[in-house]
């Protein structure tokens, strides 16, 4: 608590301006009216207050708005936002995308702080879903944002928002997240023609099932090896040598360099060596000729 003291004569602040940096903490507390501060918050950002002085200003706003700041104040917090705790932010009701952008700008170029994470959470919950504009904004500031969400949270992303997602936004997503995002992407891009569709869906294919990969193999898509290596192993295993050859097109030669890595390694183990030899890549490890392949998973299902 800052002790209450009378404002010295002639020091009462008539506006929020740069002269206030010369005020001691107790003078700020005594001479700056909280309501004046609230209406002129936008000016604070241009004034080099010390952290101690900012603490006083925050304290004044907290006293004025014990239930949480109104959005008109929040939008102009500027670097005072860095002084807010997640507990403070949980009291806010942020509905405007402009307010969100203004506060994200303050933290720009830095890791997502607990304050920012809380702010985003409040905003998204208030909207009920991650709409396209919000997703656009969040991924612009934090390309990894989408992959920081749980599969449950991702389920609230409407397919229409998928148009805002860029390939780099999915770089850190794990298979569980792509499992949720892929069907949404498939729905979002369903009206596109073959080659355009593939360009858009490519980043999401880590969540694609076998039947969709088989379908793609019929469309001359020429999938690159980097994309192939991110496919689900369980989705790749049932693909035939011919299907993989069609799926990769000219990139099929890259399998040799990846033969010791999943999913290529596991896929090779499932193929007949005869079939692998038709690729002419020298892939080894397939099932020798004359061996019978038992699908034990099928057998278990029948027993």
């Amino acid at each position: 608590e800052v002790e209450k003291t009378a404002c010295p004569s002639g020091k009462k602040a008539r506006e929020i301006d740069e002269s206030l940096i010369f005020y001691k903490k107790w003078e700020l507390e005594a001479c700056v009216d909280a309501a004046l501060l609230a209406t002129q918050m936008d000016r604070v950002n241009a004034i080099p207050f010390t952290y101690e002085q900012l603490d006083v200003l925050k304290h004044k706003l907290d006293e004025l708005y014990p239930q949480g700041y109104p959005e008109s104040v929040i939008q102009h917090l500027g670097y005072l936002f860095l002084k807010m705790s997640p507990e403070d932010i949980r009291k806010w009701n942020v509905t405007s995308l402009e307010t969100l952008k203004a506060l994200l700008e303050v933290n720009k170029g830095h890791e997502m702080s607990p304050q920012v994470a809380t702010l985003i959470d409040r905003f998204v919950k208030g909207r009920g879903q991650l709409d396209k504009d919000t997703l656009d904004t969040l991924t612009a500031f934090y390309p990894g944002y989408l992959c920081s969400l749980s599969p449950e949270e991702l389920s609230s992303v409407p397919p229409s928002s998928i148009w805002a997602v860029r390939p780099q936004d999915l770089d850190t997503c794990d298979p569980r997240q792509l499992d949720v995002l892929y069907p949404k992407a498939r729905l979002a891009f369903q009206n596109m023609n073959g080659s355009e569709y593939f360009v858009k869906i490519q980043s999401f294919l880590g969540g694609a099932p076998t039947e969709d990969l088989k379908a793609l193999s019929q469309q001359n898509v020429s999938m690159d090896l980097a994309t192939f290596m991110k496919l689900r192993t369980d989705a790749v295993l049932p693909l035939t040598v011919a299907e993989v050859q069609k799926l990769l097109g000219p990139h099929v030669e890259g399998l040799k360099a990846e033969e010791r890595h999943r999913p290529v390694r596991d896929w090779i183990l499932r193929q007949r060596q005869d079939d692998l030899d038709t690729l002419g890549l020298g892939l080894q490890g397939g099932i020798p000729n004359g061996y019978l392949v038992l699908d034990l998973s099928m057998q278990e299902a029948l027993s």
């Epitope: 301006d17 740069e18 950002n45 241009a46 004034i47 080099p48 500027g78 670097y79 860095l82 700008e105 303050v106 720009k108 170029g109």
Partner: nanobody
Amino acid sequence: QVQLVESGGGLVQAGGSLRLSCTTSTTFSINSMSWYRQAPGNQREPVAVITNRGTTSYADSVKGRFTISRDNARNTVYLQMDSLKPEDTAIYTCHVIADWRGYWGQGTQVTVSS
């Protein structure tokens, strides 16, 4: 990271003048530029500030003697110090707020002899 380069400090006799300058390399939008000083055994204190609107303000102890100005094209802030007194002796440090973050220079020594 924003780099600040100060110059212009030195030794001067009481009543003399010095002009400090501080240049920043930042491409960020600058909100304000200011000068602080710290005398031996004292806390750092603000001396003068100029905002992005061009408005200025001064500590009572330097009013009428010091003038802060800014060259936006060069991203430079100046502190013209006239009628210097021995009590102005201190390390003068430039401070910039750019894109809502504060950055400090290394400081330049000003010594006023009587």
